[in-house]
Interface confidence: medium
């Protein structure tokens, strides 16, 4: 609880706020939780804090961790917890799900795409906007203030926006990309008994003790808009939120998104600092909609090295 | 030392509207937020609503939502709790309160309202 | 809306007696609870705030306990000024009190 994940990629601007709720006038504390060291306040720091901000300028792989945040009220202390996990830049077009913010949904009508996260950041307009890594051209497109609209929405505009915006600091620029699936709704749809694609029924997945492993779980449900449609990650037949681990967290957003014309919903199990005790656990990929349940099991098991002589 | 002194107590009428004021002193108002509390003769605490003084955000328990006002006054210190369309079951000592977004840490000596026709 | 159980409703116990009161809420709310007591006639008082952190200048016979949707207020050995009613409050959506616990002098 008060644990909020949050990632991004090296070489760009992070900014993190502080999940515990509270006025702009409180004072907070930074520390990384691990050691207990203060974060400094500076700002000729790479990483600093700034009240309930914490701004990594630019992020590194290395700044990956929790870190405290204590929110001094007069009257109370409170404290939360950022879960921060910067990512190497990927070398192709592929955005990984666990790069993609919360999936947005438009029709004619509608068909507003807000940059995620864009609202922590110290930004002019306008926006960069990148449909599946190609830069969006012509005249459907506009980008206005900290969304994108399209007009005349067709099936064929969903996919993975991403924007790209320039942070402000001190006089000094640094760059953030955030993308995001944008799904279009189709009146013609029809719902599936929930198919799994990821991952397979009963996988064993290897992980390395002590480092970080994403898990997937990714279902079909249909065709067009879904009216419930939901994936979720149980452990050991528990809800997340029922299992007080803040190293494993589920995603809040769930990433929808069409593969060959079927509506399919994502949502990613984050282990932070592998531990031996979580090779113990059942993990759970529920899939649910208004036909039923489905329910996929993945196991975890210690990466083997082989030595070659 | 924090002190918070509500207004006198009130008879209304049903149908009528009330409106409490609470004074905080040795404590700036906008540093914390300000918290209603509904307590009925003999029984339990109710939270009513919250505000943020600094900026007039409120947020009001769904019980009350649409009875309810809260409202400050930055400049005096003061924090009001306005009850609209008042019922015989909102006689109660009503109490307000300062502290943090998640509770309440110093309370005022509570207003009672006594709805009779 | 997030439901709270307190229990027992009242108990009675005597001076010295270590007295547990229980609340139970629905749904997982983590440590957002706090524990206040209030007396006949006067404004609630903080003791304790999320779960176990106490109130400065309360007596450190008092003490909180649980996490998820089980909580605790231990006191450890009571005190005649002890003898008031107990309120949890949660904080995790909104504010909701419990019912009370009415503590008497058996």
């Known amino acids: 609880k008060f644990s909020k994940q949050s990632w991004g990629l090296e070489n760009e601007a992070l900014i993190v706020r502080c999940p515990r709720q509270g006025k702009s006038s409180y004072i907070v504390d930074w520390y990384y939780s691990q050691t207990n060291k203060s974060i400094p306040t500076q700002e000729r720091n790479r990483v600093f804090a700034s009240g309930q901000l914490l701004k990594f300028l630019p992020a590194e792989v290395a700044d990956s961790g929790i870190y405290t945040c204590i929110v001094r009220s007069p009257t109370f202390n409170r404290t939360g917890y950022a879960n921060v996990t910067i990512y190497k830049k990927q070398p192709d077009c592929n955005v990984p799900d666990y790069l993609m913010y919360s999936t947005v949904s438009g029709s004619e009508k509608n068909s507003k795409i807000y940059c995620p996260t864009i609202d922590l950041y110290n930004w002019t307009a306008p926006l960069e906007w990148f449909k599946n890594c190609q830069a969006l051209q012509g005249s459907r497109y506009k980008a206005h203030k900290s969304f994108l609209v399209i007009d005349n929405v067709m099936t064929d505009d969903a996919g993975d926006y991403t924007c790209k915006f320039i942070h402000n600091e001190n006089g000094a620029n640094y760059s953030v990309t955030a993308t995001r699936s944008f799904t279009v709704k189709d009146e013609q749809g029809f719902s599936l008994f929930p198919v799994i694609r990821a991952p397979a029924h009963n996988e064993t997945k290897e992980v390395e003790i002590g480092e970080n492993t994403n898990l997937t779980c990714s279902a079909c449900f249909g065709k067009g808009a879904q009216f419930l449609a939901t994936v979720q990650w149980q452990l050991n037949g528990n809800k997340i939120t029922d299992f007080s681990e803040p190293r494993i967290q589920q995603e809040e957003g769930q990433n929808q998104s069409f593969s060959n014309g079927l509506a399919c919903v994502n949502t990613v199990l984050r282990i932070a600092d592998v531990k031996e005790e979580d090779l113990l656990l059942r993990y759970d990929c529920l899939a649910l909609n208004l036909h039923g349940l489905r329910r996929h099991t993945i196991r975890l098991s210690r990466k083997h090295h082989h030595h070659h002589h | 030392e924090v002190q918070l002194v509500q207004s006198g107590a009130e008879v209304k009428k049903p149908g009528a509207t009330v409106k409490i004021s609470c004074k905080v002193s040795a404590f700036n108002i906008k540093d914390d937020y300000m918290h209603w509390v509904q307590q009925a003769p003999g029984k339990g605490l109710e939270w009513m609503g919250r505000?943020?003084?600094?900026?007039?955000?409120?947020e009001y328990a769904e019980k009350f939502q649409g009875r309810v006002t809260i409202t400050a006054d930055t400049s005096t210190d003061t924090a009001y709790m306005e009850l609209s369309s008042l019922r015989s079951e909102d006689t109660a000592v009503y109490y307000c309160?300062?502290?943090?977004?998640?509770?309440?840490?110093?309370w005022g000596q509570g207003t009672l309202v006594t709805v009779s026709s | 809306d997030i439901q709270m159980t307190q229990s027992p409703s009242s108990v009675s116990a005597s001076v010295g007696d270590r007295v547990t009161i229980t609340c139970i809420t629905n749904t997982d709310i983590d440590d957002v609870i706090h524990w206040y007591q209030q007396k006949p006639g006067k404004a609630p008082k903080l003791l304790i705030y999320?779960?176990?952190t106490l109130r400065p200048g309360v007596p450190s016979r008092f003490s909180g306990s649980g996490s998820g949707t089980d909580f605790t207020l231990t006191i450890s050995s009571l005190q005649p000024e002890d003898f008031a009613t107990y309120y949890c409050l949660q904080s995790d959506n909104m504010l909701t009190f419990g019912q009370g616990t009415k503590l008497e002098i058996k």
């Open positions: 505000i943020d003084p600094a900026i007039g955000n409120t």
């Open positions: 309160a300062t502290g943090d977004f998640y509770a309440m840490a110093y």
């Open positions: 999320e779960g176990n």
